[in-house]
Every structure is written in structure tokens, then in C-alpha cells.
Interface confidence: low
């Protein structure tokens, strides 16, 4: 079976596909299992290195899991006639490390795409939008599943992985109809701030099992349809007032916060107050403190303001400032000592002069003291200019 998976553009692919015999409705590619009744094709765990070219036109659900596809080029699923019925595409665990721009073009009904468990060292910004236009044609995608797509450290590009994924999600505003986005288990340290603003239709967002420390710069404000927000198993320490207000303002949301290392000090007071009155957080009675040591395993809902104190330790921002100040002062001190050392002879001479001047000065004081002590010389002392 010929395949144009190595093609870097969909145009040559379409040409070759057009010249081949159009696939028969009932044919099934080698190494695949097909069910026309279920509109399903499964090419699972077959070590395929390319997407089969001869997929049947009836396919609605295509499973290409457990293969060795490596690269998904532009137009990887483009056919003539197109696979107009394809609605669900599962490519999980197929050792993909590169998804190029336009890889999912010419799939007009594609609603669900699963790229999970592929070590994506390169995800083109135009993987989902299909073009580099500032505003692309809307993608039909409703569900995008990108769990555990982080590559191993040695395969990572220099650029931030979070930034690479974010660029693909916002390109051309193509994913404005996305309802579900799963980004679990990707070692995310932060969420790029403009991503959610470009996904206004989200109902379900899964960011669980990442390394998110803070949501301070993330805005949920325009996710007015958001129904489930999964933040379990991250590194969240506290949610600040801005985030709390935004979550409370979403009319429909349920938030999942289990298994985060909550820091129960004075900065937690607002979050505890909010937790006690909100219906937004699912399983809020399970949330417990991780730090400081004396608060470990205390239930957040059972805390009151007296429990939430801060040791008289400088906050991290001030600590950083004072460390910097200390370094500057040390440098100034070192320069000062160096100057003293280089001018040691002059300083020695200067010191002698100072000593002599001081001696004369002190003798003057002694003289004045003696005059003041003798009542007979009082008038003289008042006129004296010592």
C-alpha cells in the first residue's frame, strides 16, 4: 500500500491520492480491523510507521494506537474523496514525536482527537488550525485530548514546552468551539496566560497531575461555559483572591483541587474563608494542609484565622531583595577595602596627621576644663576662644 505520509505538504498527497483508485466502501487496510456496521477501523498495536492510505470512506471512528508513526505530516489524513465521516481519531501511544502544520486538514467532521502518550518534541503551531493565517477557518474539534505528551528531557527543544502547546491551541483562533481539553500529566510549571482566553467554549478542562505552583496569572474570566476544572495533583500552595473571585463568578463550574501541597499560613486565610462558603469545589472536605509541619494533614475547612499565622520570617520577595542588597553592600565593602589597601601609605600618613590634630584638640579641651574649674578665671573663660 502506498502512502504519502512523508510528504511535507498536502498538495502532492492529494494529487497522488486522486490518481489512485478511490477506496472501495468495504475495503479494509492491511493490518487493520474494520466494521462497517460500527463505522470503525482499528489499526492497533501493529507497529505501523505511516497512516494507511486506503482507509474506507465510511470510517467514523479510527484507532491508530500503539504504533510507531514518529511523524504526522501535513495532510496525513487527506484523501480524495475526503474522509468526510471521520469524527473520532485516536493516535495515542503511537510514538509520535512530531506533528506538523495541517496534519488534520481535510477532516471536516473531526470532533474528537486523542494524541495522548506521545512524546511530542515538536507540535506545530498550525497542527490544529491548518494554516498560518491570523484567523483560520474554525476547526470542527470539540474534544482535544493531550494527556502525557511531554517528551523526555533529552528530546525537549530549547523553547518552553508549555509555550509550544499553547501556540498550537491559540493559532488562528481555530479552536473556539472546543468543549473539552485534557492536558493532564505534562509537567506543566505554568499555564500561558493567553491560552484560555482563546478557548471560550470550554466545558471541561483537565490540568491534573502537572506541576502548577500558582494560578495568579491565569484568567478564567471568559470561560463562562466551564463546567469541570481539574487541578488535582499539582503543586498549588494557595489560591489568591483574584482567582477565587473568578472561579466564583463562573456560573456553572465545579473545581477539583485534591492532592495539592496547600501551605496553611496567613496567606491561606482568604482561601479558607472562600472554601467554607462556596459550592464550587468538589470534595472540599478532603483538602488538607501540607505545610508548615505543625499544620500537616489539618483539614482546610476546619481551620480558623487563629490557626493561620505567619512566622516573622521575611516573605520570599523581601528575602530576595535583602539578599540582593547584601550582595551589593558586600561588593561596596570589598571595593572600599581594596581602595584602603592600595592607599595604605597615604592613609598611614593621614592617620598620623589626624592623631596629631586630635592630640592638639584634646590639649585644648584640657586647658578649657582647667579654666572653667577655677572660679577666679571664669570671666576669662567666657571670653576665651579655645
Amino acid at each position: 500500500t502506498s502512502s504519502a505520509s512523508s510528504s511535507s505538504s498536502s498538495a502532492p498527497f492529494l494529487a497522488s491520492a486522486a490518481s489512485a483508485q478511490p477506496p472501495l466502501p468495504d475495503q479494509c487496510p492491511a493490518l487493520c480491523e474494520c466494521s462497517e456496521a460500527a463505522r470503525t477501523v482499528k489499526c492497533v498495536n501493529r507497529n505501523l510507521t505511516e497512516v494507511p492510505t486506503d482507509l474506507p470512506l465510511y470510517v467514523r471512528n479510527l484507532f491508530l494506537t500503539g504504533n510507531q508513526l514518529a511523524v504526522l505530516p501535513a495532510g496525513a489524513f487527506a484523501r480524495r474523496p475526503p474522509l468526510a465521516e471521520l469524527a473520532a481519531l485516536n493516535l495515542s501511544g503511537s510514538r509520535l514525536d512530531e506533528v506538523r502544520g495541517g496534519a488534520f486538514e481535510h477532516l471536516p467532521s473531526l470532533r474528537q482527537l486523542d494524541l495522548s502518550h506521545n512524546p511530542l518534541a515538536y507540535l506545530s503551531p498550525f497542527a490544529f488550525s491548518g494554516s498560518n493565517a491570523s484567523i483560520s477557518a474554525p476547526s470542527p474539534l470539540v474534544e482535544l485530548i493531550l494527556n502525557h505528551i511531554v517528551p523526555p528531557d533529552d528530546k525537549r527543544q530549547n523553547r518552553s514546552f508549555e509555550g509550544m502547546v499553547a501556540a498550537a491551541l491559540v493559532a488562528g483562533r481555530a479552536l473556539q468551539g472546543l468543549h473539552l481539553l485534557e492536558l493532564a500529566s505534562n509537567h506543566f510549571l505554568y499555564l500561558p496566560r493567553d491560552v484560555l482566553a482563546q478557548l471560550p467554549s470550554l466545558r471541561y478542562l483537565d490540568l491534573s497531575n502537572n506541576s502548577l505552583v500558582s494560578l495568579t496569572y491565569v484568567s478564567f474570566r471568559n470561560l463562562t461555559h466551564l463546567e469541570s476544572l481539574h487541578l488535582e495533583d499539582n503543586a498549588l500552595k494557595v489560591l489568591h483572591n483574584g482567582t477565587l473571585a473568578e472561579l466564583q463568578g463562573l456560573p456553572h463550574v465545579r473545581v477539583f483541587l485534591d492532592n495539592n501541597p496547600w501551605v496553611c499560613d496567613c496567606h491561606m486565610a482568604d482561601m479558607v474563608t472562600w472554601l467554607k462558603q462556596t459550592g464550587v469545589v468538589q470534595g472540599k472536605d478532603r483538602l488538607t494542609c501540607a505545610f508548615p509541619e505543625k499544620m500537616r494533614n489539618r483539614v482546610l475547612l476546619e481551620l480558623n484565622s487563629a490557626d493561620l499565622d505567619c512566622d516573622p520570617i521575611l516573605p520570599p520577595s523581601l528575602q530576595t531583595s535583602y539578599v540582593f542588597l547584601g550582595i551589593v553592600l558586600a561588593l561596596i565593602g570589598a571595593i572600599f577595602l581594596l581602595v584602603l589597601y592600595l592607599n595604605r601609605k597615604g592613609i598611614k600618613k593621614w592617620m598620623h596627621n589626624i592623631r596629631d590634630a586630635c592630640r592638639d584638640h584634646m590639649e585644648g579641651y584640657h586647658y578649657r576644663y582647667e579654666i572653667n574649674a577655677d572660679p577666679r578665671l571664669t570671666n576669662l573663660s567666657s571670653n576665651s576662644d579655645v
Epitope: 471512528n61 469524527a87 474528537q112 474534544e143 469541570s228
Partner: antibody, heavy 118, light 110 residues
């Protein structure tokens, strides 16, 4: 917690009819509410839903033929121009949550019978 | 448009036996499927949601499985009270659908 339908009756074709679902023991702003109908001897037919914050969704065949709205305690289903094939028992049902996604009905009314006949 | 096809339309089994009902979605609905039981003159009752999660107060004799497009409801250790019509319902989307429910399966207990 309960829901109860009312307003079902015999109507002539083309005469608009409004069915009302009254909710007790819970807030309609926290749940998605749906209407489902069942023609005599037939299966269940999904008409549409209104979610916690008031957005409505209809089955393709129901668009334009039905309108769902709500107040703080009731959910209405208006049959804009009833036809004989709209004869059925109409059920009001509450979703498990306020979601429109991953939605299922865990609380049902007993239904109200609408008969459309000339 | 997310059509739900239930098979068989009717099934009969003896008390103590097992019944299996299948539901097929025309497109993948992940695990967002519910099963209901309806007896004559009564409203439907939720049995299972999210394909396999038992609703509150429902006997563990009812078991749901499947994901994507293929789903199964299995009723084990059949009792006469299980005689009813069973419906599947997709909860994946409320947009662009004709009927969220399957056509129903009548279970007769001998």
C-alpha cells in the same frame, strides 16, 4: 426533592400549549432541566434542556416546534403549534448537575399527557 | 447526529439468569452514557451513568461497561422485578442530535 408536570390536556392541532414543571427542594439555577416525551407504546424521545444559567439546547427535530424557558421555581415547555404526532406523555426531568455535558437525568416527574386531536 | 442504536429490541430470560443489552453510538461519546429502567405507567429510573457508575440505591446486579461507541448493560441474577424496558442515553453533547436515547430493549422475565 421532586419535580411535577402540569398543563397536559386535549388540544386541537395548531393551538399553542404550555406545560409547566414545578421544582421543589432544590434550586433550578444549580441544575439542568430537560423535557422528554413518550408517545403511547413508543420509546423515550429527547426534546431539549435548559441548563443552570438559562441556555437552551434542542433536538434537531424540535427546533422551532418547542420553546423551553424557566423562572426561579418552574420550567416551561411551550408547544408552539401542536400536531397529532405530538400526542404523548411529557416528562420533566432534572439533570444530575448543572452541566449540559456528561448529562443524565436522576429525578423524573410522573409525566403529563398531551393529546392533540381535531 | 449521535444516533443511539439499542439491541436487541426484546429479550427473555429466566429468573436467576443473565441478560445483556447493547447500545451503539454512531460516533464516539467517550464514557458519557447512562442507562435507565422504565416500568409501565412509571417514569424512567436512572440505573447507571458515566457508562459504568451505579446510581444511588441501584442494585449491584446491574453492571455497565464500554466506552467510545460500544456499550453494554448486564443484569445478573435476574429477578421478576427486573421486567421492564431499558434505555441508553448519550450525555456527550446536547447539540446537533436527533434523539439522545436509544430505541429501548424490553426485558421479559420467565
Amino acid at each position: 426533592q421532586s419535580v411535577e408536570e402540569s398543563g397536559g390536556r386535549l388540544v386541537t392541532p395548531g393551538t399553542p400549549l404550555t406545560l409547566t414543571c414545578t421544582a421543589s427542594g432544590f434550586s433550578l439555577s444549580d441544575y439542568t432541566m430537560g423535557w422528554v416525551r413518550q408517545a403511547p407504546g413508543k420509546g423515550l424521545e429527547w426534546i431539549g434542556i435548559i441548563n443552570g444559567y438559562g441556555s437552551t439546547y434542542y433536538a434537531n427535530w424540535a427546533k422551532g416546534r418547542f420553546a423551553i424557558s424557566k423562572t426561579s421555581t418552574t420550567v416551561d415547555l411551550k408547544i408552539t403549534s401542536p400536531a397529532t404526532e405530538d400526542t404523548a406523555t411529557y416528562f420533566c426531568a432534572r439533570g444530575d448537575t448543572g452541566r449540559t455535558y456528561d448529562m443524565h437525568f436522576n429525578l423524573w416527574g410522573q409525566g403529563t399527557l398531551v393529546t392533540v386531536s381535531s | 447526529a449521535y444516533d443511539m442504536t439499542q439491541t436487541p429490541a426484546s429479550v427473555s430470560a429466566a429468573v436467576g439468569g443473565t441478560v445483556t443489552i447493547k447500545c451503539q453510538a454512531s460516533e464516539s461519546i467517550r464514557s458519557w452514557l447512562a442507562w435507565y429502567q422504565q416500568k409501565p405507567g412509571q417514569p424512567p429510573k436512572l440505573l447507571i451513568y458515566s457508562a459504568s457508575t451505579l446510581a444511588s440505591g441501584v442494585s449491584s446486579r446491574f453492571k455497565g461497561s464500554g466506552s467510545g461507541t460500544q456499550f453494554t448493560l448486564t443484569i445478573g441474577d435476574l429477578e421478576s422485578a427486573d421486567a421492564a424496558t431499558y434505555y441508553c442515553q448519550q450525555g456527550y453533547t446536547s447539540s446537533n442530535l436527533d434523539n439522545a436515547f436509544g430505541g429501548g430493549t424490553e426485558v421479559l422475565v420467565k
